[in-house]
């Protein structure tokens, strides 16, 4: 399987909400011995590999924001902790998974990574991630609503398997 990032750049005004999205592509095994662990974190553009660094999103670590379930099942993060920080991660039946950030501030600007790990009995993990940039703007140059920029075809599928 692969992870696609439909948009590589989100430009939003301060105070707005944004939903960053990744999509799981390709054959997804729905067997009883397969679990998908999905999460989000902030990162930096490493010299060797993007998304190697894992930094918290609004003080919540990737462990706090994870979802885990079998196949293309729907799931949401535990509400209290995430929602207190204006965050919610969710996953639907079609392989889409997202993080919603409410009331954006300039401090939210940066690189965001989604991670999917396939866990199956007696197999090494299969890891894939996607990366996208969030720019929060203020002042007269800021858009009135979030503007999203589609990924180029080669960027939209970011495959890192182990």
């Amino acid at each position: 399987f692969k992870v696609a990032t439909p948009y590589s750049l989100y430009v939003c005004p301060e105070g707005q909400n944004v939903t960053l999205t990744c999509r799981l592509l390709g054959p997804v095994d729905k067997g009883h011995d397969v679990t998908f662990y999905k999460t989000w974190y902030r990162s930096s553009r490493g010299e060797v590999q993007t998304c190697s660094e894992r930094r918290p999103i609004r003080n919540l670590t990737f462990q706090d924001l994870h979802l885990h379930h079998g196949g293309h099942q729907a799931a949401n993060t535990s509400h209290d902790l995430a929602q207190r920080h204006g965050l919610e991660s969710a996953s639907d039946h079609h392989g889409n998974f997202s993080i919603t950030m409410r009331n954006l501030t300039l401090l939210d600007s940066g690189l965001y990574c989604c991670l999917v790990v396939e866990i199956r009995h007696h197999h090494s993990e299969h890891r894939v991630h996607g990366a996208m940039e969030l720019q929060v703007q203020t002042g007269k140059d800021a858009p009135s609503n979030c503007v999203v920029y589609p990924s180029s075809s080669q960027d939209s599928e970011n495959i890192t398997a182990a």
Epitope: Q63, H68, I119, R127, A162
Partner: antibody, heavy 118, light 107 residues
Framework: QVQLQQSGAELMKPGASVKISCKAT????????IEWVKQRPGHGLEWIGE????????NFNEKFKGKATFTADTSSNTAYLQLSSLTSDDSAVYYC???????????WGAGTTVTVSS | DIVMTQSHKFMSTSVGDRVSITCKAS??????VAWYQQKPGQSPKLLIY???YRYTGVPDRFTGSGSGTDFTFTISSVQAEDLTVYYC?????????FGGGTKLEIK
């Protein structure tokens, strides 16, 4: 605060079995691997294997197949390592560690010393 | 299995010195390498992940670098409490494997 609390030291006879526990607190137990690592006196770290409590998925170091058995009880947030047919080679400190999927061994238990002696 | 080799079992250093420990993987592990510190009678402690990133709360005198097969762990100014054992580990593919360890000793 994430913690792994391991059971106390064990003195065992050759041929016996021992079961070590690792109780997890401060995180969602079902969503991270529990790793088991062996360290003999004066030696390095040797990975035994892992269990993912949420699904029961297991991975082993081939060397420990038939020697080690992993179980996890999600109702008590406790993982177990059972070692069978003990010999002096099994005398070691056994550590449990947490590993979130796609990540490293970020939190370790204090270790359980197993001594096999007749 | 991927073999992680720490060529020096022991290294001599002095307080205030800069010291580097090397680790070589038997095949390409990209940047999927961690470094752990283990003090006598204690469990290992994660210091560096993904080859070059400090784990939460780790002092900035500890740094890591490398990719592919060659990795280096550096302490910029050794403190007395740093004189202990360090292990590298790959998490590129299971079975997860550790280096044999390098013990930092006083000169």
């Amino acid at each position: 605060q994430v913690q792994l609390q391991q059971s106390g030291a064990e003195l065992m006879k050759p041929g016996a079995s021992v079961k070590i526990s690792c109780k997890a607190t401060g995180y969602t137990f079902s969503s991270s691997w529990i790793e088991w690592v062996k360290q003999r006196p004066g030696h390095g770290l040797e990975w035994i294997g892992e269990i993912f409590p949420g699904s029961g998925s297991l991975n082993f170091n081939e060397k420990f197949k038939g020697k080690a058995t992993f179980t996890a009880d999600t109702s008590s947030n406790t993982a177990y390592l059972q070692l069978s047919s003990l010999t002096s080679d099994d005398s070691a400190v056994y550590y449990c560690a947490r590993r979130p999927p796609g990540w490293f061994f970020d939190v370790w238990g204090a270790g359980t010393t197993v001594t096999v002696s007749s | 299995d991927i073999v992680m080799t720490q060529s020096h079992k022991f290294m001599s250093t002095s307080v205030g010195d800069r010291v580097s420990i090397t680790c070589k993987a038997s095949q390409d592990v990209t940047t999927d390498v961690a470094w752990y510190q283990q003090k006598p009678g204690q469990s290992p402690k994660l210091l560096i992940y993904s080859a070059s990133y400090r784990y939460t709360g780790v002092p900035d005198r500890f740094t890591g670098s490398g990719s592919g097969t060659d990795f280096t762990f550096t302490i910029s100014s050794v403190q007395a409490e740093d004189l202990t054992v360090y292990y590298c580990q790959q998490h590129y593919s299971s079975p997860w494997t550790f280096g044999g360890g390098t013990k930092l000793e006083i000169k």
